[in-house]
């Protein structure tokens, strides 16, 4: 049986989580991919997704999350910049394949963000604008926020009020002028 395994990342506030999710490129290269957070007892919540169909090497930014899908390599790169303590939690990459349920990619990421900055002097760590030069673009991505109950960590949600429908739409602002609002509601 497939075991759901976790990989832990311990980072400080202001730092960047940078992970890569490996997928079968022949099957999923142009499929829409998403980055989700999993809270105990709730359905996974989609925080950001690639376009539909997913574009090769085209950065999509939602708040502090940057997704880049490298079709030639079968790799989705996920970066969460300027981490906050509240970002701590369990995350996963998924591939949307309607009408089937989303396909989860290994491993889940257990992110632990702690207070205090422990970077190298002059490493540009807090100035994410300098580090991440993303081409100016305005992207509109439709994120189908449904997911299978089998990925619920404990019990199903008590209410479906917070579970978005496949028609939910996330408007991405111009990434050169991102409003730094909290990513998590």
């Amino acid at each position: 049986a497939t075991k759901l395994t976790e990989e832990k990342y311990e980072l400080k506030e202001g730092q960047t989580l940078d992970v890569k999710c490996d997928y079968t490129l022949e099957k999923f290269a142009s499929s829409q991919k998403a980055w989700q957070i999993i809270r105990d007892g709730e359905m996974p919540k989609t925080l950001a997704c690639t376009e539909r169909p997913s574009k090769n090497s085209h950065p999509v930014q939602v708040g502090r999350i940057i997704l880049e899908d490298y079709h030639d390599h079968g790799l989705l790169r996920v970066r969460m910049v300027n981490l906050q303590v509240e970002d701590s939690g369990l995350y996963q990459c998924v591939i949307y394949q309607p009408p089937k349920e989303p396909h989860m990619l290994f491993d889940r990421i257990r992110l632990v963000v702690t207070k205090g900055f422990s970077g190298t002097p002059g490493s540009n760590e807090n100035s994410t604008q300098n580090v991440y030069k993303i081409p100016p673009t305005t992207t509109k991505a439709l994120c189908p926020l449904y997911t299978s109950p089998r990925t619920v960590t404990q019990a199903p949600p008590k209410s479906t009020a917070d579970v978005s429908t496949p028609d939910s739409e996330i408007n991405l602002t111009n990434v050169t002028d991102i409003i730094r609002v909290p990513v998590f509601n």
Epitope: T5, L11, T16, V19, D22, T24, L25, H73, D107
Partner: antibody, heavy 119, light 108 residues
Framework: EVQLLESGGGLVQPGGSLRLSCAAS????????MSWVRQAPGKGLEWVST????????YYADSVKGRFTISRDNSKNTLDLQMNSLRAEDTAVYYC????????????WGQGTLVTVSS | EIVMTQSPATLSVSPGERATLSCRAS??????LAWYQQKPGQAPRLLIY???TRATGIPDRFSGSGSGTEFTLTISSLQSEDFAVYYC??????????FGQGTKVEIK
């Protein structure tokens, strides 16, 4: 418990061929990329090749490109490295390594198999 | 290709002392760095990944720091089993993923 067991090493003449195998157990094999890393006697570690979990993507070090072929059989949980046109400088201990699920680092290693290329 | 440079090549330390090993990348790799320990006749073992995170089962006397191009592995109080060769490795995006040439930590 993750276990990686290499086999197939030995003595081969320059220009010859050898096939290394790695039997994996203790994890969902097809969910993870796998790699070969080598170490020449008394030297440091050198990455050789990586294959994605599905086998659809492969990578090679320039020093072995066109001579070595990495492959995997997810039904048998095995990783292979076909080595052709071997040179003296390919002499090394070859390690099979599991790539972590979130990034290209190596979280588990086999014990290695020695390949000696000499006439 | 990113070049990883470790220093010093050899570090002589007495048991119980602190050891500080350095690793420099030829270009910025964010936190995409791992440290490995290798003892004679054995396979390498993962110590630290993501520059800071200790791998499962690694004692807390091992700690990693740094970002961008400069990284440090610190062993706060060397035990007899810590005398070994240590390698850093970058994993910024796609292979090739290069290793440093290693630092040998020997008994003073």
């Amino acid at each position: 418990e993750v276990q990686l067991l290499e086999s197939g090493g030995g003595l081969v003449q320059p220009g010859g061929s050898l096939r290394l195998s790695c039997a994996a157990s203790g994890f969902t094999f097809n969910a993870y990329a796998m790699s070969w890393v080598r170490q020449a006697p008394g030297k440091g570690l050198e990455w050789v090749s990586t294959i994605s979990g599905s086998g659809s993507t492969t990578y090679y070090a320039d020093s072995v490109k066109g001579r070595f072929t990495i492959s995997r059989d997810n039904s048998k949980n095995t990783l292979d490295l076909q080595m052709n046109s071997l040179r003296a400088e390919d002499t090394a201990v070859y390690y099979c390594a599991k790539v972590a699920g979130s990034n290209f680092f190596f979280d588990h290693w086999g014990q290695g198999t020695l390949v000696t290329v000499s006439s | 290709e990113i070049v990883m440079t470790q220093s010093p090549a050899t570090l002589s330390v007495s048991p119980g002392e602190r050891a500080t090993l350095s690793c420099r990348a030829s270009q910025s790799i964010n936190h995409n760095l791992a440290w490995y320990q290798q003892k004679p006749g054995q396979a390498p073992r993962l110590l630290i990944y993501g520059a800071y995170t200790r791998a499962t089962g690694i004692p807390d006397r091992f700690s990693g720091s740094g970002s961008g191009t400069e990284f440090t592995l610190t062993i706060s109080s060397l035990q007899s089993e810590d005398f070994a060769v240590y390698y850093c490795q970058e994993f910024i995006l796609f292979p090739p993923h290069t290793f440093g040439q290693g630092t040998k930590v020997e008994i003073k």
